[in-house]
């Protein structure tokens, strides 16, 4: 399996009530808003054939999916959470930025592109989707990356 | 309550095909993983092979050309064939749950396990 | 494959012992390591996944700890219910693989 490195985050970052509050508040109303319950995106089959030691890699690349290509573009939603997670994401994913795998990584951004595909092809309740998944996102960060 | 209960004949002929049954309860088999793990009188655990929540499924390669893992969701029963059986495969058979959708490779909860004994 | 090589593979201890059993990784699984208890005729019980984190329901007598390639299991005051075997696994990839077994009898 591919060595990773750097691929760590301090567990004082999934410690803090507020903010651990704030993302499942917004997960919590964003999934009442989606009306497809039989996708999804965080689940077994996004760590199929992903050593453990490879999924922090792994979770930060759907992390800078979901701040890129959905929190950005929504926004304007889901107010006021949503001006308080993003930020708090966002940091995350910053601390992230040197987290690398040496060798091939081919196995893992397949999977991350299926979920990409999903989110896409799905569109708009695609995105809202990806939101109400963010109580998964934060505790597989903090599963894979702690 | 999580419950899994592994059934099947517990005498298998040589060169046959071993078939056994896993029936759960107290979960979805379209949730959980669900593996089988074997182990002989006196030895450790060998891990054998998974099917996934999605109906997919993962063998460990020293079985790959003999075994199959398929279920019935509608029974809620992951099942178990192992061909071309010898006298090695005489053991006690397990399934496991997973123990969520992360830790998918942690056995969370167990069958109480069924004996196989392959003789003529 | 990942072979998993514990010791000692058997141990007598008396209630209120404390014990500790370790388990060798033979390439580095990070902290993937889970710890289960086997008795007769009960189905396997994990106790410990992640190296250190405690299955619910696992009594807090009960540690692991190590990372990379050397694990161990610690039973802080043996129970009489703890006398059994003990199996360590690793859970980092395929195919998952378990040592040999640390049965523990009473003294």
């Known amino acids: 399996a591919p060595i990773s490195s750097h691929c760590r985050l301090d567990k004082s970052n999934f410690q803090q009530p507020y903010i651990t509050n704030r993302t499942f508040m917004l997960a919590k109303e964003a999934s009442l808003a989606d009306n497809n319950t039989d996708v999804r995106l965080i689940g077994e089959k996004l760590f199929h054939g992903v050593s453990m030691s490879e999924r922090c890699y792994l979770m930060k690349q759907v992390l800078n999916f979901t701040l890129e290509e959905v929190l950005f573009p929504q926004s304007d939603r889901f107010q006021p959470y949503m001006q308080e997670v993003v930020p708090f994401l966002a940091r995350l994913s910053n601390r992230l930025s040197t987290c690398h795998i040496e060798g091939d990584d081919l196995h893992i951004q397949r999977n991350v592109q299926k979920l990409k595909d999903t989110v896409k092809k799905l569109g708009e309740s695609g995105e809202i989707k990806a939101i109400g998944e963010l109580d998964l996102l934060f505790m597989s960060l903090r599963n894979a990356c702690i | 309550e999580v419950q899994l209960q592994e059934s099947g004949p517990g005498l298998v002929k040589p060169s046959q095909t071993l078939s056994l049954t896993c029936t759960v309860s107290?979960?979805?088999?379209?949730?959980?993983?669900v593996h089988w793990v074997r182990q002989h009188s006196g030895k450790g655990l060998e891990w054998m092979g998974r099917m996934w929540s999605d109906g997919d499924t993962s063998y460990n390669s020293a079985f790959t050309s003999r075994l199959t893992i398929s279920r019935d969701t509608s029974k809620s029963q992951v099942s178990l064939k192992l061909s071309s059986v010898t006298a090695a495969d005489t053991a006690v058979y397990y399934c496991a749950r997973s123990l969520d959708f992360y830790y998918d490779t942690t056995l969370a909860f167990w069958g109480q396990g069924t004996t196989v004994t392959v003789s003529s | 494959d990942i072979v998993m090589t514990q010791s000692p593979s058997s141990v007598s201890a008396s209630v209120g012992d404390r014990v500790t059993i370790t388990c060798k990784a033979s390439?580095?699984?990070?902290?993937?390591l889970a710890w289960y208890q086997q008795k007769p005729g009960k189905a396997n019980k994990l106790l410990i996944y992640s190296g250190s984190t405690l299955q619910s329901g696992t009594p807090s007598r009960f540690s692991g700890s190590g990372s990379s390639t050397d694990f161990t299991l610690t039973i802080s005051s043996l129970q009489p219910e703890d006398f059994a075997t003990y199996y360590c696994?690793?859970?980092?990839?395929?195919?998952?693989?378990f040592g040999q077994g640390t049965k523990l009898e009473i003294k």
């Open positions: 696994q690793q859970h980092n990839e395929y195919p998952l693989t």
């Open positions: 390439k580095t699984i990070s902290k993937y």
């Open positions: 107290g979960f979805s088999l379209t949730s959980y993983s």
